[in-house]
């Protein structure tokens, strides 16, 4: 069981949408629902997600990256991992950084994954700069 | 299958060279050759690879740290990672950042990956600071 | 054999100490024993933290974050990986910054896995931002 | 609507100090940033620095530096550059302008403040 | 500093004619596949408008007869069919690193 999405442009809204179709997209054995990747099987996981976020103008607004779990029988979301960058980069200068997350997880069957952004004008999609993936243990 | 490369001094070009040797290094059942490793069983990898950049007087020159794969099936090799930073440190100053990429890549024989940089002289090639490796899934 | 453990705010002194019980944690088939963890059989392993280092007002103090290992055959430590950074915020700014680490290493029965940072009082410990885990290949 | 509105014109001896303030309506100030143009009569225009709206920190066109200080303040949407030890040839207009990161340009502009250097 | 250089500075042109407005950077503006080159339209006793960014995207609200093209060091600005109202002064500025840089302008006037 494994997924390997990326980036996906049209993302107007949160949680992120991923390519799951194109290019060099994995999706076996787990499936991907509006932003999601829904866990059929429990066991353990590693999940991880890059996010690429770049500007023109710096104006240092906090940036932040999570990787979430939803499930019904829960009320509340719960932050699996999260990255958070504040001053980290020179005002008005173009910058680029990325934040990276990866580690291992107790999933459990309907479990669904999502990755949140703080800034989402300001995450660039290419496949190989902003990603989301997992694979069974 | 497994391999964990280390820094080598001695880089020259591009791709990075990668110590195969001494050290903290894991080489098995994948090969080593020229920069890159060399797949010998198609299937699903999880690959990695930190680089550990820094200067003595920061000019924030764009730095990238990319993963990339070439099959001598393919005309061009393909881009599977990589990580941008720009305006990252104070002009002037002594400064250090590193780049972290890691992600499920479907690979075939006879594919061959390697890592590449934009500012060879900005890396630093200590074991524990800037590596490559993978793992078979 | 897997573990997952996360910050633990009251952590006073290096290296740091782990959350084992409460929470995302995840502990089995490898022992926590005072900041680290003991591998009990030899073998592949991929191991991985993250620290997630923020301040009120940057003095860019270097920071750095280290995963080492300590076997009682061996008289020195030896740092598996390393994350560094100099000059990553704008000074008298709020600022905040993570540090990311994972690789494969060949462990052996008793090795001890220690995480180490340069300012702790910089770290926050919250569980999604701050983690120390492995599993075996 | 997007609307950046610059303070009145201004008549200041050669030696003293002017502050000219723009401030933003329609839109979320501290998304983006603000930066200074200034433009001598019948000259080109001058960039002169920029300024985040969010962080409050400046970075200055070299030319200007030790004489121009940029500010902000969030709680009234409105930034500030202040420019001393005045001289004649620095009357001119002087306008604001916002950049928004995730863009390539200054998208609005205030509509100016004359500031006239004269004995 | 990157140094723009604007020619010519005035263009005479009759109205209905095209215009071709150029400008040269003292070093390349392209990063990452995307050209920092922008050009603003001024009229007298008004701010500058943005006209064009990153060399070819046309700003929101801004007329189709305008149009942008150019990479690396050679921008051009170009008015197909030229309008009353589009006689004014016309800058490019690029906005590749700080400090920004502007042309000296082009007039552009009624022949």
């Known amino acids: 069981k494994v997924a390997h999405l990326t980036g996906k442009p049209n993302s107007r809204s949160m949680p992120l949408e991923w390519e799951d179709t194109y290019g060099i997209v994995l999706l076996s054995g787990v499936k991907y629902k509006k932003g999601g990747l829904v866990i059929n099987e429990t066991g353990l996981y590693f999940v991880y997600s890059k996010v690429y976020f770049r500007g023109q103008s710096c104006t240092n607004l906090p940036l932040s990256h999570k990787v979430y779990m939803r499930n019904s029988k829960y009320p509340q979301d719960l932050v699996m991992m999260e990255g958070k960058m504040m001053s980290y980069c020179t005002t008005g200068q173009m910058w680029a950084h990325s934040s990276y997350l990866g580690a291992v997880f107790n999933l459990t069957s309907a479990d669904h994954l999502y990755v949140n952004v703080s800034e989402l004008s300001l995450v660039n999609f290419e496949e190989s700069q902003t990603f989301f993936g997992l694979y069974k243990l | 299958k497994v391999a964990h490369l280390t820094g080598k001094p001695n880089s020259r070009s591009m791709p990075l060279e990668w110590e195969d040797t001494y050290g903290i290094v894991l080489l098995s059942g994948v090969k080593y050759k020229k920069g890159g490793l060399v797949i010998n069983e198609t299937g699903l990898y999880f690959v990695y690879s930190k680089v550990y950049f820094r200067g003595q007087s920061c000019t924030n020159l764009p730095l990238s740290h990319k993963v990339y794969m070439r099959n001598s099936k393919y005309p061009q090799d393909l881009v599977m990672m990589e990580g941008k930073m720009m305006s990252y440190c104070t002009t002037g100053q002594m400064w250090a950042h590193s780049s972290y990429l890691g992600a499920v890549f479907n690979l075939t024989s006879a594919d061959h990956l390697y890592v590449n940089v934009s500012e060879l002289s900005l890396v630093n090639f200590e074991e524990s600071q800037t590596f490559f490796g993978l793992y078979k899934l | 054999k897997v573990a997952h453990l996360t910050g633990k705010p009251n952590s006073r002194s290096m290296p740091l100490e782990w959350e084992d019980t409460y929470g995302i944690v995840l502990l089995s088939g490898v022992k926590y024993k005072k900041g680290g963890l003991v591998i009990n059989e030899t073998g592949l392993y991929f191991v991985y933290s993250k620290v997630y280092f923020r301040g009120q007002s940057c003095t860019n103090l270097p920071l750095s974050h280290k995963v080492y290992m300590r076997n009682s055959k061996y008289p020195q430590d030896l740092v598996m990986m390393e994350g560094k950074m100099m000059s990553y915020c704008t000074t008298g700014q709020m600022w905040a910054h993570s540090s990311y680490l994972g690789a494969v290493f060949n462990l052996t029965s008793a090795d001890h896995l220690y995480v180490n940072v340069s300012e702790l009082s910089l770290v926050n410990f919250e569980e999604s931002q701050t983690f120390f885990g492995l599993y075996k290949l | 609507q997007v609307q950046l509105v610059q303070s009145g014109a201004e008549v200041k001896k050669p030696g003293a100090s002017v502050k000219v303030s723009c401030k933003g309506s329609?839109?979320?100030?501290?998304?983006?940033?603000i930066h200074w143009v200034r433009q001598a009569p019948g000259q080109g225009l001058e960039w002169m620095g920029v300024?985040?709206?969010?962080?409050?920190?400046?970075s200055y066109n070299q030319k200007f530096k030790g004489r121009v200080t940029m500010t902000v303040d969030k709680s009234t949407s409105t930034a500030y550059m202040e420019l001393s030890s005045l001289r004649s040839e620095d009357t001119a207009v002087y306008y604001c302008?916002?950049?928004?990161?995730?863009?390539?340009?200054?998208?609005?502009w205030g509509q100016g403040t004359l500031v006239t250097v004269s004995s | 500093e990157i140094v723009m250089t604007q020619s010519p500075a005035t263009l005479s042109v009759s109205p209905g004619e095209r215009a071709t407005l150029s400008c040269k950077a003292s070093q390349s503006v392209d990063y990452d596949g995307d050209s920092y080159m922008n050009w603003y339209q001024q009229k007298p006793g008004q701010a500058p408008r943005l006209l064009i960014y990153?060399?070819?995207n046309l700003e929101s609200g801004i007329p189709a007869r305008f149009s942008g093209s150019g990479s690396g060091t050679e921008f051009t600005l170009t008015i197909s069919s030229l309008q009353s109202e589009d006689f004014a002064v016309y800058y490019c500025?690029?906005?590749?690193?700080?400090?920004?840089?502007f042309g000296q302008g082009t007039k552009l006037e009624i022949k």
């Open positions: 300024i985040s709206t969010y962080q409050g920190d400046a």
């Open positions: 329609g839109y979320t100030f501290t998304d983006y940033t």
């Open positions: 500025q690029h906005s590749r690193e700080l400090p920004y840089t």
């Open positions: 990153a060399a070819s």
């Open positions: 302008a916002r950049f928004p990161d995730w863009d390539y340009a200054m998208d609005y």
